[in-house]
Amino acid sequence: YDFTNCDFEKIKAAYLSTISKDLITYMSGTKSTEFNNTVSCSNRPHCLTEIQSLTFNPTAGCASLAKEMFAMKTKAALAIWCPGYSETQINATQAMKKRRKRKVTTNKCLEQVSQLQGLWRRFNRPLLKQQ
């Protein structure tokens, strides 16, 4: 999906008002310095591409993020403010339902969500130069 035409300011508002709080809740009990941010993004469409990938694509050691509250709210925000997004995700969602696994919060998932927090922070500051 091409995130170029999304309403970035509305997505930013959704992140600040709800998604960020759900990410913090998920990470509660872990130190902010515990994980190094290894995933980065260069502009807002790129950030959303990376956020979508980390949130909804199962990875080795973490297959259960898509049903978390922050993930559902992320999906809703992208569907509401990115034209055509929800429809492109229909097939992906159906495939994901077939391979849904038992919900377990692993260290790998915590690391992945820590990466997501970094990507969202970057999304909110698009004019900052890449380090």
């Epitope: 035409n5 809703a76 509401i80 034209p83 055509g84 997004y85 929800s86 429809e87």
Partner: antibody
């Protein structure tokens, strides 16, 4: 400029058929759900039918189910409403609108000028 | 089906004065993802309807900030802080939580 232009309205006898068309321009038509809404003379708005961007999901009001068929041609940026077995109560101005999918929460953010369909003998 | 009820049926307002329209749904319009699927439209005399507010409180593009939406669950309000002559017409609320999508009966706003 984002625009929706309807055509195909007119006078038809009860039991007859009519095909409404809507030409879209100024936006990537294939990214958006589309919806038909109608308004009987002097009355309020009534949702008729919605179709998602790739025609994967189609919805109808009970009052038109089995008689009306919504379709779209993304290559031609066009939306259609085939209306069969028309009744007097189908008399209304029919609006082509953008929305009805998840974008903007399903709200209808672009409206055509409307086309009048009159069912009378 | 979700029934949408608007009050009042009509409203006569002095220019510069505020106006308020209420919309009530027969069931909650809150989606499990946290958004509420309630929208407001204005149909000016002789024109097609236009989107004013979506998802309860988000102003559509080009809509003046004198229009605001609020509410939650089943009770919603559209406010015009200072009515202008160009605001006359019929205001409709709509729910898109589930099909059939349904509109309120409309509220006619006129200038005194």
């Amino acid at each position: 400029e984002v625009q929706l232009v309807e055509s195909g309205g007119g006078l038809v006898q009860p039991g007859g058929s009519l095909r409404l068309s809507c030409a879209a321009s100024g936006f990537t038509f294939s990214n958006y759900g589309m919806t038909w809404v109608r308004q009987a003379p002097g009355k309020g708005l009534e949702w008729v039918s919605s179709i998602t961007f790739a025609s994967s999901y189609i919805y109808y009001a009970d009052s038109v189910k089995g008689r009306f068929t919504i379709s779209r041609d993304n290559a031609k940026n066009s939306l259609s409403l085939q209306m069969n077995s028309l009744r007097a109560e189908d008399t209304a101005v029919y609006y082509c609108t953008r929305g009805g999918g998840a974008y903007y929460g399903g709200s209808l953010d672009v409206w055509g000028q409307g086309v009048l369909v009159t069912v009378s003998s | 089906d979700i029934v949408m009820t608007q009050t009042p049926l009509s409203l006569s307002v002095t220019p510069g004065e505020p106006a308020s329209i209420s919309c009530r749904s027969s069931q909650s319009l809150l989606h499990s993802y946290g958004y509420t699927y309630l929208h407001w439209y204005l149909q000016k005399p002789g024109q097609s309807p236009q989107l004013l507010i979506y998802l309860v409180s988000y102003r559509a593009s080009g809509v003046p900030d004198r229009f605001s939406g609020s509410g939650s669950d089943t009770d919603f309000t559209l406010k015009i802080s200072r009515v202008e002559a160009e605001d006359v017409g019929v205001y409709y609320c709509e729910q898109t939580l589930q099909t059939p999508y349904t509109f309120g009966g409309g509220t006619k706003v006129e200038i005194k």
